[in-house]
């Protein structure tokens, strides 16, 4: 299974479900839907509040139980450390994948986190973030902005998903904004 | 009483396609997750495929992955295994089984050889 | 391709104890609680003895125990006796692989 990682912006935005959380007990695989889950704090809540209704409290994230099909596997030991996930509902459960945004919170930049906890959900409504992955790139729309990370190296690798968020500049525009300068 | 019986079984030639069927009795077939296991002669078990209760989730084997299709009819409480381009080394008896805890399985059939020859 | 190793063969008198050993890595056996063992007897269907490591099935013999260290699971026959002669074969959950099998011991009572 293989996928190119979503922009921060783009996982938020396509999500049913976005929380802080730590994974607080080994995996086990469900005999008839052969599905793997992963028992979960939840620490914080960033989208899904409508979502959820009452059931606001998810114990658990729920993944195939094989990589070839895109399971997720949790490869950190340490119970205490948080993880921003980003995943999808069904049936009231949360899912994951391969592809999901799981990322730990603490290598996340500032910019990210303040995304996540407020600013991302700005741009989900008009704009999107649109993959350039090989040279000539043309915007297709002037709500669309231009994600040029995987062409970059070096200092700039990654600049964009960890600074920047693509938001409404006016009706039918949307531009790259720095997260640095919203307000905390 | 619990049972799984397997069907479909026989000589095929390389490149051919046969498909197996597991008739299930005895247990409520939708609320299991079910399995293709396969023994070479003489030699050990190897797991081919597995599918969840609902059908929903399949997992195949390297070796027969993008070759063999598990499906299942709960309606009917069936099992199945498509085998398309079916090569000398597929050639075993293959046995359906039924996951329980701990991913084990517990009930098994009473297997059907396949054998891939010309 | 044999994921899981066990020995080829082992050998005990009537009485004695035998233990058949099974090792993986840390994405299956070590990984896992999802160790299961089975007999089988020539030209019939393996027959579960252990599942979940150290639980036994209704309906097997106390003689039968299983334990873990690390990537390494056991299955322990006491008190041996001659119709527990057959192959036994060890599987794991491999979140790589799905399902994985030992390549079967051959258990012969002298």
């Known amino acids: 299974c293989t996928c190119v990682p979503p922009h921060p912006q783009t996982a938020f935005c396509n999500s049913d479900l976005v929380i802080r959380a730590k994974f607080v007990g080994t995996p086990e695989v469900n005999q008839t839907t052969l599905y793997q889950r992963y028992e979960i704090k939840m620490t914080k809540m960033y989208k899904g509040f409508q979502a959820l209704g009452d059931a606001a409290d998810i114990r658990f994230v729920y993944t195939p139980a094989m990589e070839s099909v895109c399971g997720y596997f949790h490869r950190s030991h340490n119970r205490s450390e948080e993880f921003l996930i980003a995943g999808k509902l069904q049936d009231g459960l949360l899912h994951i994948t391969t592809c999901s945004f799981v990322a730990p919170w603490n290598s996340l930049s500032l910019a990210q986190r303040r995304g996540f906890t407020k600013t991302y959900t700005v741009g989900c409504e008009e704009c999107t973030v649109f993959p350039c992955l090989s040279i000539p790139c043309k915007l297709q729309s002037g709500t669309h902005c231009l994600w040029t990370d995987q062409l970059l190296q070096g200092s700039e690798k990654g600049f964009q998903s960890r600074h920047l968020a693509c938001l409404p500049r006016e009706p039918g525009l949307c531009t790259w904004q720095s997260l640095r300068s919203q307000i905390a | 009483q619990v049972q799984l019986v397997e069907s479909g079984g026989g000589l095929v030639q390389p490149g051919g396609s046969l498909r197996l069927s597991c008739a299930a009795s005895g247990f409520t077939f939708s609320s299991y997750a079910m399995s293709w296991v396969r023994q070479a002669p003489g030699k050990g078990l190897e797991w081919v495929s597995a599918?969840?209760?609902?059908?929903?989730?399949?997992y195949y084997a390297d070796s027969v992955k993008g070759r063999f299709t598990i499906s299942r009819d709960n309606s009917k409480n069936t099992l199945y295994l498509q085998m398309n381009s079916l090569r000398a080394e597929d050639t075993a008896v293959y046995y359906c089984?039924?996951?329980?805890?701990?991913?084990?399985?517990?009930?098994w059939g009473q297997g059907t050889l396949v054998t891939v020859s010309s | 391709d044999i994921a899981l190793t066990q020995p080829a063969s082992v050998s005990g008198s009537p009485g004695q104890s035998i233990t058949i050993s099974c090792t993986g890595t840390?994405?299956?056996?070590?990984?896992?609680?999802?160790v299961s063992w089975y007999q089988q007897h020539p030209g019939k269907a393996p027959k579960l003895m252990i599942y979940d490591v150290s639980n036994r099935p209704s309906g097997v013999s106390n003689r039968f125990s299983g334990s873990k260290s690390g990537n390494t699971a056991s299955l322990t026959i006491s008190g041996l006796q001659a119709e527990d002669e057959a192959d036994y074969y060890c599987?794991?959950?491999?979140?790589?692989?799905?399902?994985?099998f030992g390549g079967g011991t051959k258990l012969t009572v002298l």
């Open positions: 599918i969840s209760g609902s059908g929903g989730s399949t």
């Open positions: 840390s994405s299956d056996v070590g990984g896992y609680n999802y």
């Open positions: 599987q794991s959950y491999d979140f790589y692989k799905f399902n994985v």
């Open positions: 089984a039924r996951y329980w805890r701990g991913l084990s399985f517990d009930i």
